[in-house]
Amino acid sequence: QPSVSPGEPSPPSIHPGKSDLIVRVGDEIRLLCTDPGFVKWTFEILDETNENKQNEWITEKAEATNTGKYTCTNKHGLSNSIYVFVRDPAKLFLVDRSLYGKEDNDTLVRCPLTDPEVTNYSLKGCQGKPLPKDLRFIPDPKAGIMIKSVKRAYHRLCLHCSVDQEGKSVLSEKFILKVRPAFKAVPVVSVSKASYLLREGEEFTVTCTIKDVSSSVYSTWKRENSQTKLQEKYNSWHHGDFNYERQATLTISSARVNDSGVFMCYANNTFGSANVTTTLEVVDKGFINIFPMINTTVFVNDGENVDLIVEYEAFPKPEHQQWIYMNRTFTDKWEDYPKSENESNIRYVSELHLTRLKGTEGGTYTFLVSNSDVNAAIAFNVYVNTKPEILTYDRLVNGMLQCVAAGFPEPTIDWYFCPGTEQRCSASVLPVDVQTLNSSGPPFGKLVVQSSIDSSAFKHNGTVECKAYNDVGKTSAYFNFAFKGNNKEQIHPHTLFTP
């Protein structure tokens, strides 16, 4: 029994004065607590507690369930205990079948013994199955058997407490170990779409998927910079043990422009948190924005190819697209496709492929697109660069030599005189008159230039060259002169192509 120095309060004393007492089933338990400030007896076993305000605890016919710790407490809060075993060969174990374990922690299989003198107190697997090799345990007859460092793999493990009694193995009723997993990573969160574009009045619905080892993972939808509670609906599944999935669906049945913003799906567990966001843009009506991928004024050489390319944003989806030239709609030579296969894609590409363009095919090419809300168009002005062509070269009645050339860009006409039989015409002749004529063809066609010189200036035999040129190339026409006396005679003019 405890002893303390005089003057200090001392713990109560218990009779019989031993820490453990063994009685047989059916015998009397008589425990006396001696203390001037006696308060109560408390009995504890498994998950039960009982109290008695008498200083003598008497149980006339002891049962196995009277096995447990009897504690006497005085008014100073000091206490003393005795543990009583009620030996019952028919009930060797007291059992609380509730058995939970937290991963990586110890857990107690509560099967205290009624007889401390039995041997080989241990755990056994159900139906003769062996226990996991790494399962370690420590038996304590008064409390049960402590499993050390519970593993996730022990979940749903079926166990018995076991003792040897008179050479035979006796098993308790079965226990099923339920392991609560430790969170060793943050939840995995994903969202159905990263961005949403809606018209006013349309329904906004977005789903966040949360995956974790347990359904105790916390999740919520939040609006950034807002404390307003959002309405969510949930679906959840257990895909086997420690593989839990929740879908949290946020819905705004009729979205308004001021609902636009960033929404965050947030999840956390005891390890940490994770989040994912989605952006909602609500517009009052649909739109189409066209972006040319090349300059809208296009210059192309005769016979070459050009692609007219536009990208455009269309919401809602485009319904009609067409390319038009000279009031005619192209039925082929163009393609239209989404910029990406992403479900939320609103960007599209349209390409018109113009091949081996002729000088007569310059002009305005227009792309038109529409959806249920708006129409939009963009025009490309296509100019076909052509080498000059000399349309006419004549000696006029007034003695003028005239050269008319067409091409794009606008040709320049230079005149040269070659005296006698020389092949190279180098002496330039200044024109008397230069005019740009209006073409009778379509706009964006060739430009026509007329240039004239006075032939009376030439006094010797020779050749006059009219040379028309631009960025693409050059072409020449020639006038041959021969003098007979005072008469000047025009020999047939001819052209020479100069690359």
Epitope: L46, D47, E48, T49, N50, S98, Y100, K102, N105, L108, R156, K174, I176, K178, R180, S214, S215, S216, V217, Y218, S236, H238, D241, Y244, N269, T270
Partner: antibody, heavy 118, light 107 residues
Framework: QVQLVQSGAEVKKPGSSVKVSCKAS????????ISWVRQAPGQGLEWMGT????????RYAQKFQGRVTITADESTSTAYMELSSLRSEDTAVYYC???????????WGQGTLVTVSS | DIQMTQSPSSLSASVGDRVTITCRAS??????LAWYQQKPGKAPKLLIY???SLQSGVPSRFSGSGSGTDFTLTISSLQPEDFATYYC?????????FGQGTKVEIK
């Protein structure tokens, strides 16, 4: 023997919240899960959620997720269930029970009648 | 979530009759099934756990069987105090579901 003793009947207005308590006596509290189950008049049993064993966040039935909050105070061996945004169909007897983490319910509270009426 | 379907929803029987109630799970729940008895105005009372284990203090006329998806509660000889509503409950995962109940009435 462990007993679960619940708080008394409540009458609440639609849109308000109710908090029901469940005190364990005659035993320890921390090594068990505590669950909440409700029963509307003339209807069956409906699991709402479970807290414990050990520390950590509760687990809720998806029907009540976001509207129910289950907490526990080990120092007083008391569990609580709070249900918000009450509507008339939440009128029911609310029970606490011992167990529920992959286990049956071996001990039940006496039940708390919550009436939601305007 | 796992759905539990009980049948019949009600039955009439006499004292001494053998009564069988069945419960079917929408997916396998091994033997993680309990049976409860509830009388009007009272909390449910656990009868059977782990499909076939009799809860302490419950009369031996109650028995449970089954595994996987199909389960049975049997009352071998119905007593007057057994007229009540019986519920099955699965607890295979953290999410728990009950059957809709079977009311046992006096014929």
């Amino acid at each position: 023997q462990v007993q679960l003793v619940q708080s008394g009947a409540e009458v609440k207005k639609p849109g308000s919240s109710v908090k029901v308590s469940c005190k364990a006596s005659g035993g320890t509290f921390s090594s068990y899960a505590i669950s909440w189950v409700r029963q509307a008049p003339g209807q069956g049993l409906e699991w709402m959620g479970t807290i414990g064993p050990f520390e950590g966040q509760p687990r809720y039935a998806q029907k009540f997720q976001g509207r129910v909050t289950i907490t526990a105070d080990e120092s007083t061996s008391t569990a609580y269930m709070e249900l918000s945004s009450l509507r008339s169909e939440d009128t029911a007897v609310y029970y606490c029970a011992r167990g529920g983490y992959i286990s049956d319910f071996d001990v039940w509270g006496q039940g708390t009648l919550v009436t939601v009426s305007s | 979530d796992i759905q539990m379907t009980q049948s019949p929803s009600s039955l009439s029987a006499s004292v001494g009759d053998r009564v069988t109630i069945t419960c079917r799970a929408s997916q396998s729940i091994s033997n993680y099934l309990a049976w409860y008895q509830q009388k009007p105005g009272k909390a449910p009372k656990l009868l059977i756990y782990d499909a076939s284990s009799l809860q302490s203090g419950v009369p031996s006329r109650f028995s449970g069987s089954g595994s996987g998806t199909d389960f049975t509660l049997t009352i071998s000889s119905l007593q007057p105090e057994d007229f009540a509503t019986y519920y099955c409950q699965q607890y295979y995962y953290e999410s728990i579901t009950f059957g809709q109940g079977t009311k046992v009435e006096i014929k």
